[in-house]
Amino acid sequence: SPLPITPVNATCAIRHPCHNNLMNQIRSQLAQLNGSANALFILYYTAQGEPFPNNLDKLCGPNVTDFPPFHANGTEKAKLVELYRIVVYLGTSLGNITRDQKILNPSALSLHSKLNATADILRGLLSNVLCRLCSKYHVGHVDVTYGPDTSGKDVFQKKKLGCQLLGKYKQIIAVLAQAF
């Protein structure tokens, strides 16, 4: 299931202690996502059929509206805050894609499965990032921004927005995995 649209309100009172070696776990989750990002991208554009597989640059280029910035040379705190925003953006966008694909490509079960598995890792990553921000920097809430809502778009636009998002996801997750 997709990430909740509104992140849980946190008061920076951690009910459970953060996981041991939290930064290592964050790195591991990013590596996991990076390792499967290209396969997810290929699975997606293949499932959409023509004209997607032969027009990747045009239809699946990573030009995404209002995507949160990331500065790899920032402090740990700044990178974690920016990572959190990116994960929320990706998570909600992935939720939209999953919803659309279940209707547009109901038989693409391996795609649905991979989208759900990615969303699960993103959820765990989100929890770990907030735990780190809370325990080390006293930041219990990060204000976020969301991607474009695909409901109300036509079939082609839904497929294209999804492909662009996954192209961006593949690109940014490599940067994030390297930065941490």
């Epitope: 920032g74 805050v81 920016e82 080390k136 006293h138 930041v139 809430h141 204000d143 969301y146």
Partner: antibody
Framework: EQLEESVGDLVKPGASLTLTCTAS?????????MCWVRQAPGKGLEWIAC????????TYYATWAKGRFTISKTSSTTVTLQMTSLTVADTATYFC?????????????WGPGTLVTVSS | ELVMTQTPASVSEPVGGTVTINCQAS??????LVWYQQKSGQPPKLLIY???MLASGVPSRFKGSGSGTQFTLTISDLECADGATYYC??????????????FGGGTE
């Protein structure tokens, strides 16, 4: 990149007033906190409110400002501060400021300020 | 509610000297602290962010340090142009309804 507050006013106690902050050289598609800070004559700085420019439009207020002050994003380059039930104690220079999206960033960009005088 | 206490309220030092301004937070704020300089009739100017990071265009004579509840701004090799009021400020969102955004009382 610049911020400019609308011209302040002389108003009577109990009156309402809306201040506007206009950004130039940038828009709110960047992720910032747009905030209002005031300074009574000869006194220190006092935070009033902030609004997040991301799609959630989250708002935050100083405890004393809740209920009487309202911050709003009215376009991709303007933020307003509505003030009601004004008292003499609200006489101050009101500054609009842009805060960074990361904790500890602070306000790197300020408007020149506008004087609001509340007097009978 | 968080209180930021700044000391001293005023300080005077000769040109070339060094000044130290202290800021104490009533609770642990990690490194989420900012320092500003304000001259008469002007808006404040950001000097230091994240407790110790020098803002763009600020000379290295200005140094911020500290973490948790105790913070210091040190200005060395004082110049006449440094005559101003200095403010510390906490800056972070502690929860979805609480932006910790308080200023110290200022040091002239």
């Amino acid at each position: 990149e610049q911020l400019e507050e609308s011209v302040g006013d002389l108003v009577k106690p109990g009156a309402s007033l809306t201040l506007t902050c206009t950004a130039s050289g940038f828009s709110f598609s960047g992720l910032y906190y747009m905030c209002w800070v005031r300074q009574a004559p000869g006194k220190g700085l006092e935070w009033i409110a902030c609004i997040w420019t991301g799609s959630t439009d989250s708002t935050y207020y100083a405890t004393w400002a809740k209920g009487r002050f309202t911050i709003s994003k009215t376009s991709s380059t303007t933020v307003t501060l509505q003030m009601t039930s004004l008292t003499v104690a609200d006489t101050a220079t009101y500054f609009c400021a842009r805060g960074g999206g990361v904790p500890g960033d602070g306000y790197a960009l300020w408007g020149p300020g506008t004087l609001v005088t509340v007097s009978s | 509610e968080l209180v930021m206490t700044q000391t001293p309220a005023s300080v005077s030092e000769p040109v070339g000297g060094t000044v130290t301004i202290n800021c104490q937070a009533s609770e642990d704020i990690s490194s989420n602290l900012v320092w500003y300089q304000q001259k008469s009739g002007q808006p404040p100017k950001l000097l230091i962010y994240d407790a110790s990071m020098l803002a763009s265009g600020v000379p290295s004579r200005f140094k911020g340090s500290g973490s948790g509840t105790q913070f210091t701004l040190t200005i060395s090799d004082l110049e006449c142009a440094d005559g101003a009021t200095y403010y510390c400020q906490s800056y972070y969102v502690a929860s979805s309804s609480y932006f910790v955004n308080g200023f110290g009382g200022g040091t002239e």
